[in-house]
Interface confidence: low
């Protein structure tokens, strides 16, 4: 086997190994992208839930304040 | 230039391209992992905020219910 052939076979081996490595990385990246997108969806859903809770909180706080004022008025004898 | 040498040069070209593709995928995977971990932190923080908001909501709802009952009682007795 000539040096050139040996070098070529070495290159072919490297090429095969690199292809496998590249394919593994592609799979890994795809899986990670899928996981990232799922997480992004979860985060968006959480942000939406948080917004709704904040609105509910504000609404409840307003109603509580109004009710507290009503209690104060009633206690003072103002119907 | 012999066919073997040409083939070898072609292999080297492919090897270079694959190496860069592999390196780029490695970088992409690393960046994606970092982004994923940041997103995971964000999600955990959001979940904690959501828990706190839910507790505040329950507390406000209880206080509103209690205040509403107080209003009803006072109205019955005073007006």
């Amino acid at each position: 086997v000539t040096g050139t052939q040996e070098a070529q076979e070495g290159l072919q081996g490297q090429l095969g190994a690199l292809r496998r490595e590249r394919d593994q990385l592609e799979t890994q990246t795809r899986d990670l992208e899928a996981a990232y997108n799922n997480l992004l969806r979860d985060k968006s859903a959480l942000e939406e839930e948080k917004r709704q809770l904040e609105q509910e909180n504000e609404d409840l706080a307003r109603r509580l304040e109004s009710s507290s004022e009503e209690v104060t008025r009633l206690r003072r004898g103002q119907c | 230039v012999t066919g073997t040498q040409e083939a070898q040069e072609g292999l080297q070209g492919q090897l270079g391209a694959l190496r860069r593709e592999r390196d780029q995928l490695e970088t992409q995977t690393r960046d994606l992992e970092a982004a994923y971990n940041n997103l995971l932190r964000d999600k955990s923080a959001l979940e904690e905020e959501k828990r706190q908001l839910e507790q505040e909501n329950e507390d406000l709802a209880r206080r509103l219910e209690s205040s509403s009952e107080e209003v009803t009682r006072l109205r019955r007795g005073q007006c």
Epitope: G16, R19 | A17, R20, E21, Q24
Partner: antibody, heavy 112, light 107 residues
Amino acid sequence: EVQLQQSGAELMRSGASVKLSCTASGFNIKDYYMHWVKQRPEQGLEWIGWIDPENGDTEYAPKFQGKATMTADTSSNTAYLQLSSLTSEDTAVYYCNPFVYWGQGTLVTVSA
Amino acid sequence: DIVMTQSQKFMSTSVGDRVSVTCKASQNVGTNVAWYQQKPGQSPKALIYSASYRYSGVPDRFTGSGSGTDFTLTISNVQSEDLAEYSCQQYNSYPYTFGGGTKLEIK
């Protein structure tokens, strides 16, 4: 010497199928991904996809899914491209290439 | 799909001049870009891979540069045999895509 010999020009009827061949000499196709590229008259190049002759793995451009089928026969060192349901849009020169070397191309003409 | 835009369809130059053919990617493709030369009536020939690496046997007057979205093929000391169409290709993500090509005319 490294060479890619592609099959001769084809004149096809609309709706027919055609199978083009690309035979390599001077290197082993198993060591390369074989790409196929389309070039319509006076237009740019369009990547169809690649086949890894070693294991038959393929990657197609979405545009050519269902239109093109790439196969390879390592015993004859030949890659094939089959085009189905031909229309005038398929009239083009089709090149095989392992990224570096390109075949001379095969002209496919589709007539109504 | 990533769109590779070669805004100049034709470029005119003289023997001995220096000319730059540009290619713009619609999104980041790193350095995963190849350049091809296609002379009239011939098959394309690979000149550059990984944006800046010359294939063996390609004269050193051909130089590739760029990364991300902007890429350039520079031909210094243009020769009459450089009359051809030059196309870029990204192989960063599937489907691989080519630019529309730039035809170099020699005055």
